[in-house]
Every structure is written in structure tokens, then in C-alpha cells.
């Protein structure tokens, strides 16, 4: 029978003729830094290549014996969930293993960087086709860590890594803060957050989505036709390790923006239960667990995005975040969301020669985070049209007014303290789909692109009681790129897009009272590319 | 940079009382930061990341790498560089005393100093 | 799904011996420890004895010490009890039973975290009597 | 060894009742603990492992607490296929003992 795990990222619209990409990864070379391998078990063996690359420390105390499988138990059981012939994800892909982790499973920073100066090196000497590069290890926050990580993932490799197992914020350890690398939180049979011990998964808005990470069936190094159960992030980030090889093999040209959109893509949506996350995390933790795509063809022609959410401001009264996309990304939108519901929005802005997406604490306001819409737009021309507070009543309003350039969304900013308490609720004219609209005292911004085949449309929720959350999905064949609530409604948190649904979120409504301003209108807007849907034709 | 400091191996013996001084400070005013983890356990002081700036030729990260033991020398510090990089981050890892981070962050071309620290299988 | 079938029971004198076998499908056998479990007619369940996935580590329940023993073959995904001088008081259903469980790494350390017992046979009946 | 007492050792019930089923441990197993239903002439089967947490496919009737020394199996609500016998499990370094198990029955 197939472990569930493998069955859990097998997709559900199963076709044997079209289900795995040519010998499953053969085109892919995946680096593992990890523990010493046991490279002639049945299920690794001829496929993973042992470098010479050794830098460890000492294991730790008097009492530690060095025994051969324990040296090797961790590494081996990773080699085997990537490639393994039996239990393996991508079971035609190629493996180099670099020793960074002792027998105790323990390593340090500056070793690992050495590793990954050593497959740099490797690479600049011998280019290979596709590199993916599994950190199956985690340790406190590092700034040069993260800083190598950015560097070899800006060389066109793909890195991915464990989220760590300490129940935790995955912001506060590296490698998996890192921006560049594809983080993975781990799940069990269940769909539920893995618990490790008194532990457990990472989480928060460092991770990219989870993967199978318990009860893992795998290449166990006490014989070498043994098999074991191991548990971990470490596995979980194994399996998109995998996943990664053999869509990569499949489409050996795609960009690690690309490779990252397609994961989140073709994730299971909205599977995992929130509850074991602590309250304050649940809505920067992504609810995606990873799977193979259902077929090696008819990705191309779809308008990826995702949501990327800012680090938290901090409290001070002109604090602000900022949330940025990967470099290949277009940001499409831009949102806010604070807690305590004080915040003075959130506008685009050039930092760098790129838009960013800023958001901005008020006055007596816990802090804020900046919600970032980021999306895959080939040859994109985007820029931001403000239009400052209005003098009229009508409110502020702004449109795109270039030839052939389309809204992608809506922010709005304010410098007064807590706008709309006292205001009736301003209502956008009908008929008018291609502008943005917000109070007289706020500026406004609209994202105004031009992109082949480009088309958008605005589609609204509005819900005339209180009530906690308005959500508006675009159907499919649509992406969402832009997600705000409708001006007028004082007691609105933010907005924020998770996968195709606009979400606003409003203050407890027993905190409000049902007035006329209870009213929650969600707008979002949804795009579609006919570019990239004919060009994908013209491929097939 | 052209390195000023000479002959290494002969400066622990010929000392000048100018060259006593710190390290030149660094490029453009910017003053290097130090890091470390804010996990206690996981920290191992004693050894440090020198990173340099980005465009740090890899004989200027020599360079440093051999002014820093010369100026701990002359304070009387032993150091030892355990790797010079280059490839994907110029910069150097050195075991030394913590005692001269104040000396290393002076030095020039350096952007920051990070203090060694474990990573743990997942 | 994995299933197990265990074999061998049957009548034996005091002082007799008896092999048990246990055949199970897939990987998912060779990756777990193994239990043998009895109940006596009317009586509890007494756990017996218990075996690694490579066989290395073995363990048993006093009253058996020294007269039972527990092996595996990964080769023919099977698990055995060889019970030596046996008593009127080991008359049981005899199950063999996987012990789920995993291990995982945390701050250097390897743990074991265990499930129970998730999957049994349908056990065979050992009888000893003169 | 570690001893197990389960009590009571006969339960009578009738479905939709709420019921709970003890067992104490000599000595402290932390959170090592595993719950088992059987049937006349069958083989147990697992319903709680690691004090608290269900096992697949088991009713969410079905819930566990405790650690240390004391546990409980709880079911909320009675059903016609809930009357078995029910045993506890300690593991504690890879040897094992059941309790003597608690007998449900219809009241």
C-alpha cells in the first residue's frame, strides 16, 4: 500500500498517463546538507553522491559513543524521502550529500555557509541543469545565513528548508526567515500542525506552505534494506524538495518565482486546522499543503499570485511595515490589517527602483502589517496613480487613465488619526469598475497596469449588519490581485487575500453595535491574462 | 585598498605607537553592527563571520583577514582564520577573543560581524 | 492497507515448544517496532515481548525471560516467537500487534514518540496441557 | 515495573450516557499512555495514543486526558457499538503493561 504521505501530495484528479514529469526529477540535482548518508541502502543507492564536503563540530559530551547508523540516521532517512526508489517523491532524482550536521544531528552557521559556498563553487565549475538545495536544519535567527541563502537563490538556485520544530514563530530561526528560500511547516495524516514532543512545527508568515512531516516512512540507516518512521519539518521540507525536482524536470526554465507560485498554486487549500496555531499567527500562517501539480502541462497560461504579509511594525504611533515581492514579482495590490483596528492604511511606494507595500500605525494602535499581493506578470508596466485627500463630500477617488492600463487594486492613506468614526459611508458610483475610492480626508492609490491580454474586474460583497469577516472569492479562472473593504465602515481591521478570497476583517461587533455604519462591503478585483492563456495553447 | 600595515610576521616585534591605534574606520562613515544569537545555548562565542561589503574583492578579504591578526597581535591576542569566502558572500571566519570586535568592526570594508552559532537537525 | 496474519498455535505439552509466525504486507512492516500480545481465556491483555525494526534491541516481560524469543525477517516481511518450556499459565490467544511510532530530532537530541499498538492480527491460540 | 489500575472494572450504561474509565499508574509516565476497545473474539483496537490524542478513524465521541499518574477515557455520548471491553496501555522505555480493563455494559 502507498504511505499516506505520498498519497497526500499525489493529486486528486490522479491520471496514470500524465501524472509524473519525465523519470520523476532526472533532470534535477539536489543538494543535501545534512548528517553523514548511508549511500549503499536500497533505496538511495546509485542515486545519491557523497561529496567530500565535511565540516562539523565535536559531538557533545563524555558518555556520546559514535555508532555508525545513528551518525547517518537523519541524512539517510532525507535522501530517501526526496529519491528513495521505494518511499521517494521524485524517484529519478539525482542527490549530492555535504556533511554539515554531526552524529548528534547538531552543526553550526559558519559550516553551513562553507556548504553552501562549496555547491556555489560547484556550480560556477561544472553548471548543471536545475540545483535544488534541502537545509533540513534550523537555528536561531542569522543574518549572514539568511544573506548566503539570498545570494545562491539569486544564482538561479532553488533553496528549500525546514521551518524548525520548536513550536514557534518561524521568523525567529534560520535558514527559514530567509526570504528567498521556500520554508516548510510540517502536517500529519490528519491535516493537522505536527506536534513534536512537548513541541512542534514553526509557523507564522515565514513559512511558504506545509507538507507531510509525520509518521514518514523512509531509508532507516540500521541495515541497508531497513526502513524507519521519522518526523520533522526536516521530512516535510523533503517532500517539496521533491515535489520541486520533478516540477522542475518537467519545466527545467522555471524562475524560483515561478517554482514558489506553482507550489502555492497547487497546494491543497484551507485543509489544516488553524486552532493549534496560536491566535496571533493563524492569519499570517498560510493554510497550504503542498502537492504535485495534476499534470506537467497548462500551468503556463494562469495569472499566479500569493499574499505576502509584512513583519509586525511594533506599537510606536508612526511606526509602519513594509511587505516587498521576490524580485520576478509584480505587486499588484497592496492592503493593511491591525488588531486593535487603528491604523492609517497603506500605500505603494518606489523603494529601490520596486514597488513596496507600506502600511501605517495610528495613534494608540498595537501596530500594523502590510499585506503584499505579489504576482507572476510577464512583461508587466505598472505604476501607481495617487490622488490626495478630496475637498468634495463625494470622498477621493482615482482611476487609471492610461491607454490600455488596468486597476489591480486599491490603497488608501490617512493622516488623521482614526478616520471614519464619524463618517457616513461614501459609496462608489456604479458603472465606474476602474477606479478606486476612499474617504475625503485619505490619499488614494491605484495599481494601473499594462500587460498583454491583461483584463480585470471588480467584484463586491457588502454585507449590510456587522459582522466579523466579508469575504469575496473571483471564480474560477480568475486571479485575485486586489483586496480592500469599501470605504465608510469605521470599524473595519483590514484586507487581505488568502489564495483566491478577498477577506475584511471587522471588530467584534459587540464592541461596534449595529448602526448604519455596520455595513462590510469586500471589493475585490480578479484578473485573468488572455497572453498567457494563448500563448499556453500555442505550446500544446 | 592597498594594505598599510606591511610585513605582518615583523610588525609583533616593530611596533610604532601610531599604528597602535584602531583600524582605520570604515568607507562612507557607515559603522559595522555586530550579531549574535538570541539564543543563549545555541551561541558559540569565540568564533565569528566577518562579512565585507558586497563588491570585496577576495584579496582585500585577505587583506582584512591579515590586518585583524596583526592588530590582535600587537594587542596580544592570538587569532586564527579558520576560511576566507568568496563566491557567494566575501568575508571571513576567524576564531579570536571577543575582546577585539571592537577592533574587527573598525576595520575597513567590513559590514558586519556575526557570531558563530549552532544549527540543529529538524 | 497493512494487514497481519499470525500462524502456528496449537495444543503442546508443558515443557514443549512452539513457533509463531506473523506475515505482514509492505515497507510499512520493516518500519516499525513489534509486539507480541496474549490474553488468557476470560483474562486481560499481557504484553509479551517487543522487537526494533532491524532487530538489534529486544524486550520481554519477566515471565517469559529467558524461555521466549522474538525475531524478525525483513527479507520475508515476517516476525516469530519461539516459545521454549512452556507453561499451563502461557495458554493465550497470542497477537502480534505493530508499535507505531517515529522518531524525531530536537536541540541534538533523538526521540522516539509512540502511537500504541494500530494494528493487530487476528491472533492464534496457544494451549498447554498434558 | 509499572502497574496500571483501571477502574471501575464493570461499567453499566445506557446510550447517549456520558461515561468515563480511569486508569492510574505506580508511577509517573508522563503523557505515555494509550486507550484500547475490544470485542468478544476480536482483536483490540487503538483509540487514543499519547493520553489525549485520537486515532484516525476513531468517533470524536471518543476523548482522552490526563498525565502523570492519572488518565481517563471519556465517551460523550453512548452509542450501541460503544459496549466492549476497554483497556489502558503504558509504554515506558519500550516495555509495556495493560491495565486489567473496565467491562461496558448495557445497563
Known amino acids: 500500500s502507498i504511505p499516506w504521505n505520498l498519497e497526500r501530495i499525489t493529486p486528486p484528479r490522479y491520471r496514470a498517463d500524465e501524472y509524473q514529469p519525465p523519470d520523476g526529477g532526472s533532470l534535477v540535482e539536489v543538494y543535501l546538507l545534512d548528517t553523514s548518508i548511508q549511500s549503499d541502502h536500497r533505496e538511495i543507492e546509485g542515486r545519491v553522491m557523497v561529496t567530500d564536503f565535511e565540516n562539523v563540530p565535536e559531538e557533545d559530551g563524555t558518555r556520546f559513543h559514535r555508532q555508525a547508523s545513528k551518525c547517518d540516521s537523519h541524512g539517510t532517512h532525507l535522501a530517501g524521502v526526496v529519491s528513495g526508489r521505494d518511499a521517494g517523491v521524485a524517484k529519478g532524482a539525482s542527490m549530492r550529500s555535504l556533511r554539515v550536521l554531526n552524529c548528534q544531528g547538531k552543526g553550526t552557521v559558519s559550516g553551513t555557509l562553507i556548504g553552501l559556498e562549496f555547491i556555489r563553487k560547484s556550480q560556477l565549475v561544472q553548471p548543471v541543469g536545475p540545483l535544488v538545495v534541502l537545509l533540513p536544519l534550523a537555528g536561531g535567527y542569522s543574518r549572514v545565513l539568511n544573506a548566503a541563502c539570498q545570494r545562491l537563490a539569486r544564482a538561479g538556485v532553488v533553496l528549500v528548508t525546514a521551518a524548525g520544530n520548536f513550536r514557534d514563530d518561524a521568523c525567529l530561526y534560520s535558514p527559514a526567515s530567509a526570504p528567498e528560500v521556500i520554508t516548510v511547516g510540517a502536517t500529519n495524516a490528519q491535516d493537522q500542525p505536527v506536534t513534536l514532543g512537548t513541541l512542534g512545527t514553526n509557523f507564522g508568515r515565514c513559512v511558504d506552505l506545509f507538507a507531510p512531516g509525520e509518521d514518514i516512512i523512509g531509508a532507516s540507516s540500521d541495515c541497508s534494506t531497513c526502513f524507519v518512521s521519522q518526523s520533522g519539518t526536516s521530512q516535510a521540507a523533503a517532500h517539496v524538495a521533491g515535489i520541486a525536482a520533478m516540477m522542475l524536470s518537467a519545466e527545467p526554465e522555471l524562475t524560483l518565482a515561478e517554482l514558489r507560485q506553482r507550489l502555492i498554486h497547487f497546494s491543497a487549500k484551507d485543509v489544516i486546522n488553524e486552532a493549534w496555531f496560536p491566535e496571533d499567527q493563524r492569519v499570517l500562517t498560510p493554510n497550504l499543503v503542498a502537492a504535485l501539480p495534476p499534470s506537467t502541462h497548462g500551468a503556463g497560461w494562469q495569472l499566479f499570485c500569493r499574499t505576502v504579509w509584512s513583519a509586525h511594525s511594533g506599537p510606536t504611533r508612526m511606526a509602519t511595515a513594509v511587505a516587498r515581492c521576490a524580485p520576478d514579482e509584480e505587486l499588484l495590490s497592496c492592503s493593511s490589517f491591525s488588531r486593535s483596528g487603528k491604523r492609517r492604511g497603506e500605500r505603494m511606494e518606489a523603494q529601490g527602483g520596486k514597488l513596496v507595500c507600506r502600511a501605517h500605525n495610528a495613534f494608540g494602535g498595537e501596530g500594523v502589517y502590510a499585506i503584499a499581493r505579489c504576482c507572476l506578470l510577464p512583461q508587466a508596466n505598472c505604476s501607481v496613480h495617487t490622488a490626495p485627500p478630496a475637498e468634495a463630500s463625494m470622498g477621493t477617488r482615482v482611476h487609471c487613465h492610461q491607454q490600455g492600463h488596468v486597476l489591480t487594486g486599491c490603497s488608501s492613506h490617512w493622516e488623521v488619526e482614526d478616520l471614519g468614526t464619524h463618517k457616513p459611508p461614501v459609496l462608489r458610483p456604479r458603472g465606474q469598475p476602474n477606479q478606486c475610492v476612499g474617504h475625503r480626508e485619505a490619499s488614494i492609490h491605484a495599481s494601473c497596469c499594462h500587460a498583454p491580454g491583461l483584463e480585470c474586474k471588480v467584484k463586491e460583497h457588502g454585507i449590510p449588519a456587522p459582522q466579523e469577516q466579508v469575504t469575496v472569492a473571483c471564480e474560477e479562472g480568475w486571479t485575485l490581485t486586489g483586496c480592500s473593504a469599501l470605504p465608510g465602515t469605521s470599524h473595519v481591521l483590514g484586507a487581505y487575500a488568502v489564495d483566491n478570497t478577498c477577506v475584511v476583517r471587522s471588530r467584534d461587533v459587540s464592541t461596534t453595535g449595529s448602526t448604519s455604519e455596520g455595513a462590510v462591503t469586500a471589493v475585490a478585483i480578479c484578473c485573468r491574462s488572455r497572453h498567457l492563456a494563448q500563448a499556453s495553447q500555442e505550446l500544446q | 585598498q592597498e594594505d598599510e600595515d606591511g610585513d605582518y610576521e615583523e610588525l609583533v616585534l616593530a611596533l610604532r605607537s601610531e599604528e597602535d591605534g584602531l583600524a582605520e574606520a570604515p568607507e562612507h562613515g557607515t559603522t559595522a553592527t555586530f550579531h549574535r544569537c538570541a539564543k543563549d545555548p545555541w551561541r558559540l562565542p569565540g568564533t565569528y563571520v566577518v562579512v565585507l561589503k558586497e563588491e570585496t574583492h577576495l584579496s582585500q578579504s585577505e587583506r582584512t583577514a591579515r590586518r585583524l591578526q596583526a592588530q590582535a597581535a600587537r594587542r596580544g591576542y592570538l587569532t586564527k582564520i579558520l576560511h576566507v569566502f568568496h563566491g557567494l558572500l566575501p568575508g571571513f571566519l576567524v576564531k579570536m577573543s571577543g575582546d577585539l570586535l571592537e577592533l574587527a568592526l573598525k576595520l575597513p570594508h567590513v559590514d558586519y560581524i556575526e557570531e558563530d552559532s549552532s544549527v540543529f537537525a529538524q | 492497507e497493512v494487514q497481519l496474519v499470525e500462524s502456528g498455535g496449537g495444543l503442546v505439552q508443558p515443557g514443549g515448544s512452539l513457533r509463531l509466525s506473523c506475515a505482514a504486507s509492505?515497507?510499512?512492516?520493516?518500519?516499525?517496532?513489534m509486539s507480541w500480545v496474549r490474553q488468557a481465556p476470560g483474562k486481560g491483555l499481557e504484553w509479551v515481548a517487543n522487537?526494533?525494526?532491524?532487530?538489534?534491541?529486544?524486550y520481554y516481560v519477566d515471565s517469559v525471560k529467558g524461555r521466549f524469543t522474538i525475531s524478525r525477517d525483513i527479507a520475508k516481511n515476517s516476525l516469530y516467537l519461539q516459545m521454549n518450556s512452556l507453561r499451563a499459565e502461557d495458554t493465550a490467544v497470542y497477537y502480534c500487534?505493530?508499535?507505531?511510532?517515529?522518531?524525531?530530532?530536537?536541540?541534538?537530541?533523538?526521540?522516539?514518540?509512540?502511537?500504541?499498538?494500530?494494528?493487530w492480527g487476528q491472533g492464534t491460540t496457544v494451549t498447554v496441557s498434558s | 515495573d509499572i502497574q496500571m489500575t483501571q477502574s471501575p472494572s464493570t461499567l453499566s450504561a445506557s446510550v447517549g450516557d456520558r461515561v468515563t474509565i480511569t486508569c492510574r499508574a505506580s508511577q509517573s509516565i508522563s503523557s505515555w499512555l494509550a486507550w484500547y476497545q475490544q470485542k468478544p473474539g476480536k482483536a483490540p483496537k487503538l483509540l487514543i495514543y499519547k493520553a489525549s490524542s485520537l486515532e484516525s478513524g476513531v468517533p470524536s465521541r471518543f476523548s482522552g486526558s490526563g498525565s502523570g499518574t492519572e488518565f481517563t477515557l471519556t465517551i460523550s455520548s453512548l452509542q450501541p457499538d460503544d459496549f466492549a471491553t476497554y483497556y489502558c496501555q503504558q509504554y515506558n522505555s519500550y516495555s509495556y503493561t495493560f491495565g486489567q480493563g473496565t467491562k461496558l455494559e448495557i445497563k
Open positions: 509492505g515497507i510499512t512492516f520493516s518500519s516499525y517496532w
Open positions: 500487534a505493530r508499535d507505531r511510532g517515529t522518531y524525531y530530532y530536537q536541540e541534538g537530541s533523538y526521540n522516539y514518540y509512540y502511537y500504541g499498538m494500530d494494528v
Open positions: 522487537i526494533k525494526q532491524d532487530g538489534s534491541e529486544k
